[in-house]
Interface confidence: low
């Protein structure tokens, strides 16, 4: 079942390769369990960057080795992607699934274009 998901159109990563954005989903009821997935679109290919499932009792928790971290508040999820390099510049799509209780709802945002600029190397100092 379709569900509206909103996310910013453009985000600039910090010089340390960190980008943060808010993913907000429209839901008529309170889901007990939600899955959030970040997908990177390159041409017609979509690859999963990270995913996490959280409940109303527990905070959003990505895997320890994930490139993502996040916090949740109501229908908003604050996502942070770390370790980005210039080659990672691209469209990052937020996918939200309301897992439980039924019915299952899924929605995808239009994507956030994340621009990553590699920092200039520091010149050698004498």
């Amino acid at each position: 079942k379709g569900m509206h998901v909103a996310q910013p159109a453009v985000v600039l990563a910090s010089s340390r390769g960190v980008a943060s954005f808010v993913c907000e989903y429209g839901s008529s009821g309170n889901a007990a369990e939600v899955r959030v997935t970040v997908l990177r679109q390159a041409g017609s290919q979509m690859t999963e960057v990270c995913a996490a499932t959280y409940t109303v009792e527990d905070e959003l928790a990505f895997l320890d080795d994930s490139t993502c971290t996040g916090t949740s508040s109501g229908n908003k999820v604050n996502l942070t992607i770390q370790g980005l390099r210039a080659m990672d510049t691209g469209l990052y799509i937020c996918k939200v699934e309301l897992m439980y209780p039924p019915p299952y709802y899924v929605g995808m945002g239009n994507g956030t274009q994340i621009y990553v600029i590699d920092p200039e190397p520091c010149p050698d100092s004498d």
């Epitope: 079942k1 899955r35 997935t37 999963e48 996490a52 897992m99 439980y100 039924p102 899924v106």
Partner: antibody, heavy 119, light 107 residues
């Protein structure tokens, strides 16, 4: 790419046990509920069991309740099915499958592993 | 448990034919229906979910319709690779249940 690979099938005598494994790759395994589905030779598909992403809930088909146990190890990206007190009617190809939600339209299937229960 | 009944159980068709398979649920399941294709000695492959949504990568000649208790899978122009067995499955409630299958054979 997203992949599920089952193993552990074989020939076993009635009343004995067997454990199937399903190795997942290409997606965040710890974020998905996972299922086992089986297919007896020449027959249709039968759902067997489901386990939620964190192992907190498990449901079974009546035909296997009390005999089969579904489990998972998210640190190893692996799903298991412990099958005890096997019967001839358990002879089937066992598939692990991923579903976007818990009851599920199964969007990814493994290749299957054959279990034959025979004396 | 919800019973799923497919018809016909088998059919013969030619390449280019329009093929329709029906699936009936013993009680209302809203749009919580999926269709799968299975070839001999292979795992099932997801075609359609939520009654009418095409799974990613599935050719547009496959379409699904229906809600409540009556559902249809249509192949608009049968291709050689479409000869297989097709299953419907409800996922409205536990346990998820499948139809008995429809085998599509070459005429």
């Amino acid at each position: 790419q997203v992949q599920l690979v089952e193993s552990g099938g074989g020939v076993v005598q009635p009343g004995r046990s067997l454990r199937l494994s399903c190795a997942a790759s290409g997606f965040t395994f710890s974020s998905y509920g996972m299922h086992w589905v089986r297919q007896a030779p020449g027959k249709g598909l039968e759902w067997v069991a489901v386990i939620w992403y964190d192992g907190s809930n498990k449901y079974y088909a009546d035909s296997v309740k009390g005999r089969f146990t579904i489990s998972r190890d998210n640190s190893k990206n692996t799903l298991y099915l412990q099958m005890n007190s096997l019967r001839a009617e358990d002879t089937a190809v066992f598939y692990c499958a991923r579903a976007p939600n818990y009851i599920g339209a199964f969007d990814v299937w493994g290749q299957g592993t054959m279990v034959t229960v025979s004396s | 448990d919800i019973q799923m009944t497919q018809s016909p159980s088998s059919l013969s068709a030619s390449v280019g034919d329009r093929v329709t398979i029906t699936c009936r649920a013993s009680q209302g399941i809203s749009s919580w229906l999926a269709w799968y294709q299975q070839k001999p000695e292979k795992a099932p492959k997801s075609l359609i979910y939520a009654a009418s949504s095409l799974q990613s990568g599935v050719p547009s000649r496959f379409s699904g319709s229906g809600s409540g208790t009556d559902f249809t899978l249509t192949i608009s122009s049968l291709q050689p690779e479409d000869f297989a067995t097709y299953y419907c499955q409800q996922y409205n409630s536990y346990p998820p249940t499948f139809g008995q299958g429809t085998k599509v054979e070459i005429k």
